[in-house]
């Protein structure tokens, strides 16, 4: 009876999310393998988040709006492990917007989700950021490693969206 009611709840939650995400990929987790954590198909998952790489070339503001429509934000990178996971799926000759910007050009960088900007957990390429006119951040491959660079926000780039996993 308990399992039946849990399944019913799960199905109703799935139906609720179906209007936003036509397809979800779920895995069982938790100590009793009773919880399902899901990401929209074909998003990838890492720890408690889902990631989507958009190959559409758009400005930073349009890229953020695009993520927002999908219930996400441009990616906020919190750890080197997270960055290493993300970069496995990126093309080395491309650049991708991050959810990091400096709208006033005062070198006061801010994450789109209001996560405090911690200078000690940043992965800027050597010499970057280097221009107050370049107010948005990308991740790209340079000098044999992935890192961040400041660029013009209005210049179209690919982008990475991030959202919290859906738990049902």
């Amino acid at each position: 009876n308990f399992m039946y009611s849990k399944t019913v709840k799960r199905l109703s939650k799935l139906q609720e999310y179906q209007q936003y995400y036509p397809s979800l990929t779920c895995v069982m987790e938790g100590k009793d393998m009773e919880d399902w954590s899901c990401c929209p198909t074909p998003w990838t998952s890492f720890q408690s988040s889902c990631y989507f790489i958009s190959t559409v070339m758009q400005s930073w503001t349009k890229s953020q709006n695009n993520c927002s429509v999908m219930g996400a934000d441009l990616v906020v990178i919190n750890t080197k492990e997270e960055q290493d996971f993300i970069t496995q799926n990126l093309k080395i000759n491309s650049a991708y917007f991050l959810g990091l910007s400096d709208p006033k050009g005062w070198r006061h960088w801010q994450w789109v989700d209001q996560t405090p900007y911690n200078k000690n957990v940043t992965f800027w390429h050597s010499g970057e950021p280097n221009s107050p006119d370049e107010r948005c951040a990308i991740i790209n491959f340079r000098s044999e490693e992935w890192g961040w660079n400041d660029v013009h926000c209005h210049v179209p780039q690919k982008s990475i969206c991030k959202m919290k996993k859906i738990y049902i």
Epitope: W60, T61, D133, H154
Partner: antibody
Framework: EVQLVESGGGLVKPGGSLRLSCAAS????????MSWVRQAPGKGLEWVAT????????YYPDSVKGRFTISRDNAKNSLYLQMNSLRAEDTAVYYC??????????????WGQGTTVTVSS | DIVLTQSPASLAVSPGQRATITCRAS??????????MHWYQQKPGQPPKLLIY???NLESGVPARFSGSGSGTDFTLTINPVEAEDTANYYC?????????FGGGTKVEIK
């Protein structure tokens, strides 16, 4: 006082080339992005090319891509537009304009007086 | 590309009256309260001159009779009261995304 002075315009035959120059003074040229904007006779404004302050980024509309090249010499406080394979529809007054960044975009806060390019056989 | 449509194409206004020009963008040029639409004035035989930046900010040295408003896709330039020296073409321009684009212009004549 900010000044932008264009030169190099003239009459050229279709298929020909011209190099426009813009001499900047009264500000730290190397700190600003610059653009060329043109205006055909009796028509509106059309952006033609942009170059970033550090020369790392150039951008063109499809109408001139592959034919026009924007460049700058920060040591000489000068902006250039190399125009090749010119067409009749490139006939216009060409303005150089300074970009001032605001939030996620920019506007053109100073313009030169313009130089006239006429493409005709 | 973002297309900017200005209206009217021309208007004639008596001195002391109000002139209103609108600019409609094919998609939003605003983001989190910042509106990346700008206005320029161009008098015959002269280069364009910046009037208003970011929808409503008056450029230094521009008379206070010029004002701008709007957000998203719809923006307005108002001249109130109009003076004889305001005879000119007026252009809007967006910069939220490359390529930067201009409206087709509005010709303002003083009756």
């Amino acid at each position: 006082e900010v000044q932008l002075v264009e030169s190099g315009g003239g009459l050229v035959k279709p298929g020909g080339s011209l190099r426009l120059s813009c001499a900047a003074s009264g500000f730290t040229f190397s700190s600003y992005g610059m653009s060329w904007v043109r205006q055909a006779p009796g028509k509106g404004l059309e952006w033609v090319a942009t170059i970033s302050s550090g020369d790392s980024y150039t951008y063109y509309p499809d109408s001139v891509k592959g034919r026009f090249t924007i460049s700058r010499d920060n040591a000489k406080n000068s902006l250039y537009l190399q125009m090749n394979s010119l067409r009749a529809e490139d006939t216009a007054v060409y303005y150089c304009a300074r970009q001032l960044y605001y939030s996620y975009g920019y506007y053109f806060d100073y313009w030169g007086q313009g130089t006239t390019v006429t493409v005709s056989s | 590309d973002i297309v900017l449509t200005q209206s009217p194409a021309s208007l004639a206004v008596s001195p002391g009256q109000r002139a209103t020009i609108t600019c409609r963008a094919s998609e939003s040029v605003s983001f989190h309260g910042t509106h990346l639409m700008h206005w320029y004035q161009q008098k015959p035989g002269q280069p364009p001159k910046l009037l208003i930046y970011a929808a409503s900010n008056l450029e230094s040295g521009v008379p206070a009779r010029f004002s701008g408003s709007g957000s998203g896709t719809d923006f307005t330039l108002t001249i109130n009261p109009v003076e004889a020296e305001d005879t000119a073409n007026y252009y809007c321009q967006q910069s939220i995304e490359d390529p930067p684009t201009f409206g087709g212009g509005t010709k303002v004549e003083i009756k």
